[in-house]
């Protein structure tokens, strides 16, 4: 019996990747399982093998084409199934009709760089990766800065409610090491979620000039 102890969650990166996680308490560790994608209006099918990521959780990526190719649109529906081998046959363990542009999670922003740094200020830029041209400018960002002696969880979130791929951090302390991260989210999609955080960018503010108050 399946009594609500399982979860099957997938997201589309807006271009050519659907990432899925399936978890089931009490599942056999050595069972071979896969995710099968079956679009309603396209000729291709795609399968990926679920690989363990924890005791009762498996994940895989459905690679639909070249990373920047636009493989799905807002009108597509893709039936996603979890299939597990039982003896000589495959059994459907879970099923959902997946609307790609209602279930978006973009790739983490890339190419973070310090454009300009001063004693109290730092200008940082980044790029988005593998994001559909359909969004035009309908994206938002969250950023956070790690200060000495604090954790990422304590860092206040800075929200950019538009497609702005730079930020000017102010009121920084001179001659201090910081780290910076950013993530992105489309405005579209009922079940859309934030991208993973970018790789942290480390930077150091300039020392205060000698003989001047800081």
């Amino acid at each position: 019996a399946v009594n609500g102890t399982s979860q099957f969650t997938c997201f589309y990166n807006s271009r050519a990747n659907i990432s899925c996680v399936w978890s089931q308490d009490g599942a056999l560790q050595d069972t071979s399982c896969q995710v099968h994608a079956w679009p309603d209006r396209r000729r291709w099918n795609q399968t990926c093998e679920l690989l363990p990521v924890s005791q009762a959780s498996w994940a895989c990526n459905l690679i639909l084409g070249a990373p920047d190719s636009q493989k799905l649109t807002t009108v597509d529906i893709v039936t996603l199934r979890v299939l597990c081998r039982e003896g000589v046959r495959w059994r459907v363990m879970a099923i959902q009709d997946f609307k790609p542009f209602e279930n978006l999670r973009l790739m983490a922003p890339i190419s973070l760089q310090v454009v300009h740094v001063e004693t109290h200020r730092c200008n940082i830029s980044w790029e988005i990766s593998q994001a559909s041209h359909y969004f035009e400018r309908h994206l938002e960002f969250e950023a956070r800065t790690l200060s000495p002696g604090h954790t990422w969880e304590e860092a206040p979130l800075l929200t950019l409610k538009q497609k702005q791929e730079w930020i000017c951090l102010e009121t920084l302390t001179p001659d201090t090491q910081y780290e910076f991260q950013v993530r992105v989210k489309p405005l579209q999609g009922e079940f859309t979620t934030w991208s993973p955080w970018s790789q942290p960018l480390a930077f150091r503010t300039k020392p205060a000039a000698l003989g001047k108050d800081t």
């Epitope: 399982s6 099957f8 079956w38 039936t79 363990m93 009709d97 609307k99």
Partner: nanobody, 123 residues
Framework: EVQLVESGGGLVQAGGSLRLSCAAS????????MGWFRQAPGKEREFVVA????????DFPDSVKGRFTISRDNAKNTVYLDMNSLKPEDTAVYYC????????????????WGEGTLVTVSS
């Protein structure tokens, strides 16, 4: 408010047939799978079958394979479970359920349940 209303249950003799219906209302169900669970007296609720908006379905358990079929009328937001050659062991409360994925629900998602309809198969 989302509502799932089952109908069609009742008392039937072994070897007989029933058609269960589940009418859904209160939201757009085009992203949602619909299906059936059942709970026999003194047992845990178990998954029977699910069908998506695009009318693709899961496998039936071996215990009902070849006897039960599922169908869906998207215009009416209704799912049907046709049960033939019924056996006493099919006696249970049959619950309609709807979620983005069945028999499992995605993270953060809510599974909607009906009140259940009782099917009793006498020998």
């Amino acid at each position: 408010e989302v509502q799932l209303v089952e109908s069609g249950g009742g008392l039937v003799q072994a070897g007989g047939s029933l058609r269960l219906s589940c009418a859904a209302s209160g939201r757009d169900f085009s992203s949602y799978a619909m299906g059936w669970f059942r709970q026999a007296p003194g047992k845990e609720r178990e998954f029977v079958v699910a069908i998506t908006w695009t009318k693709r379905s899961t496998d039936f358990p071996d215990s009902v394979k070849g006897r039960f079929t599922i169908s869906r009328d998207n215009a009416k937001n209704t799912v049907y479970l046709d049960m033939n050659s019924l056996k006493p062991e099919d006696t249970a409360v049959y619950y309609c359920a709807s979620a983005r994925g069945l028999p499992v629900t995605p993270l953060g998602d809510i599974i909607y349940w009906g009140e259940g309809t009782l099917v009793t198969v006498s020998s």
